[in-house]
């Protein structure tokens, strides 16, 4: 595991960003039924898997970081639903560093989802190679339980 | 090396209440769905609850409904599950368990034994 | 709730004997978005907590010797050991993993003679 002594300027960033986009949450201005809601994450499951087998096969021996916390899923709604505007930010930024045809694939999905007036925050990917290397990767794998734990809670009956 | 060590087991009276707790370590706790599954000696698995990686959303069983609340610290790599108005058929080993990417229970700990009895 | 059914419930096989055993669902636990289905076959050895073999049906968990196959598709499963070695011995059990409440089967006890 990579483990870090004292905090770095990356760690405070990421605490900030995460800090306001929790801060930012607007109201939504149209709710997509469940249905549809549906049909993007069927949408969103084999382009994220292929992404992240891709990348861990590409990659081998880079480790998940513990640094990294995507906020997924919005905490305000039931069944839970992806939380499009904490997400986006993180894929665009890693679009340069990775697939960028499967990236737009799934950039296209994630504004369907998207609520109007959402604000974006930009996110910077750390300039160390192999911290970029497990940023990237910790996103992949932390997006696609996200679209786990919604699969199995839209399959589910209500809890 | 990922570990889960389950602890705060043991004999408890009908009704009354008992905390277990899950240490993990050895992987990123917060990315990660966390499970409670038990097992009665000799018996089939029963899946209990599951939290999702952020803490925000809970799933649990009918038979443990509102009376069992599964809760995380990520700061603190724990797993908890508060249990109260235990009955007598609570009695069995429980386990956590960490969520596989896609499908299936990937990592489980050695289990905690909660007995209720009189 | 999806009700998760094995067969046979123990069998008793020599060192080397080919063994399948079957767990059928009471609904589809295929994910037509990224064709896996949400099914693992957990190992439980005496006095051991459970162990990942398979999942998504037919994915061997790492570490695990390639003996055991999973297969099958939508409702119907087979785990299949293509030369049983005595540590096998074991319960084996599976599990919807595709909703909740996730449910496991009754167990198939694997005896050694």
């Known amino acids: 595991m990579l483990s870090h002594t004292g905090p770095s300027r990356f760690a405070l960033f990421l605490l900030c960003s995460m800090e306001t986009l929790l801060s930012s949450h607007m109201a939504p201005t149209h709710q997509l039924p469940p249905s549809d809601v549906r049909k993007i994450i069927l949408e969103l499951q084999p382009l994220s898997r292929g992404l992240l087998e891709d990348y861990q096969k590409k990659e081998t021996g880079v480790p998940e970081s513990n640094r990294t916390l995507l906020l997924c899923l919005t905490s305000d709604s039931q069944p839970p639903r992806l939380n499009s505007s904490a997400i986006l930010p993180y894929f665009r930024a890693i679009r340069p560093l990775s697939d960028k045809n499967i990236i737009d694939k799934i950039i296209e999905q994630l504004d369907k989802l998207k609520f109007q007036h959402e604000p974006e925050t930009e996110i910077s990917v750390p300039a160390d190679t192999f911290e970029c290397k497990s940023f990237i990767l910790t996103i992949l794998q932390q997006f696609s339980a996200c679209l786990e734990s919604v699969f199995k809670s839209l399959n589910s009956g209500p809890q | 090396e990922v570990k889960l060590v389950e602890s705060g087991g043991g004999l408890v009276k009908p009704g009354g209440s008992l905390k277990l707790s899950c240490a993990a370590s050895?992987?990123?706790?917060?990315?990660?769905?966390m499970s409670w599954v038990r097992q009665i000696p000799e018996k089939r698995l029963e899946w209990v609850a599951t939290?999702?990686?952020?803490?925000?959303?809970?799933y649990s069983a009918d038979s443990v409904k509102g009376r069992f609340t599964i809760s995380r610290d990520n700061a603190r790599n724990t797993l908890y599950l508060q249990m109260s108005s235990l009955r007598s058929e609570d009695t069995a080993v429980y386990y956590c368990?960490?969520?596989?990417?896609?499908?299936?229970?990937?990592?489980w700990g050695q289990g905690t034994l909660v007995t209720v009895s009189a | 709730d999806i009700v998760m059914s094995q067969s046979p419930s123990s069998l008793s096989v020599s060192a080397g004997d080919k063994v399948t055993m079957s767990c059928k669902s009471s609904?589809?636990?295929?994910?037509?978005?990224?064709?896996?289905?949400?099914l693992a076959w957990y190992q439980q050895k005496p006095w051991q907590p459970p162990k990942l073999l398979i999942y998504?049906?037919?994915t061997r968990e790492s570490g695990v010797p390639d003996r055991f196959t999973g297969s099958g598709s939508g409702t119907d499963f087979t785990l299949t050991i293509s030369s049983v070695q005595a540590e096998d011995l074991a319960v084996y059990y599976c599990?919807?993993?595709?909703?909740?409440?996730?449910?496991f089967g009754g167990g198939t006890k694997l005896e050694i003679k």
């Open positions: 050895g992987f990123a706790f917060s990315s990660y769905d």
């Open positions: 998504g049906a037919s």
């Open positions: 368990a960490r969520q596989n990417w896609v499908v299936g229970l990937a990592y």
């Open positions: 599990q919807n993993d595709y909703s909740y409440p996730y449910t």
């Open positions: 609904q589809s636990l295929l994910n037509s978005g990224n064709q896996k289905n949400y």
């Open positions: 939290i999702t990686s952020g803490g925000g959303y809970t």
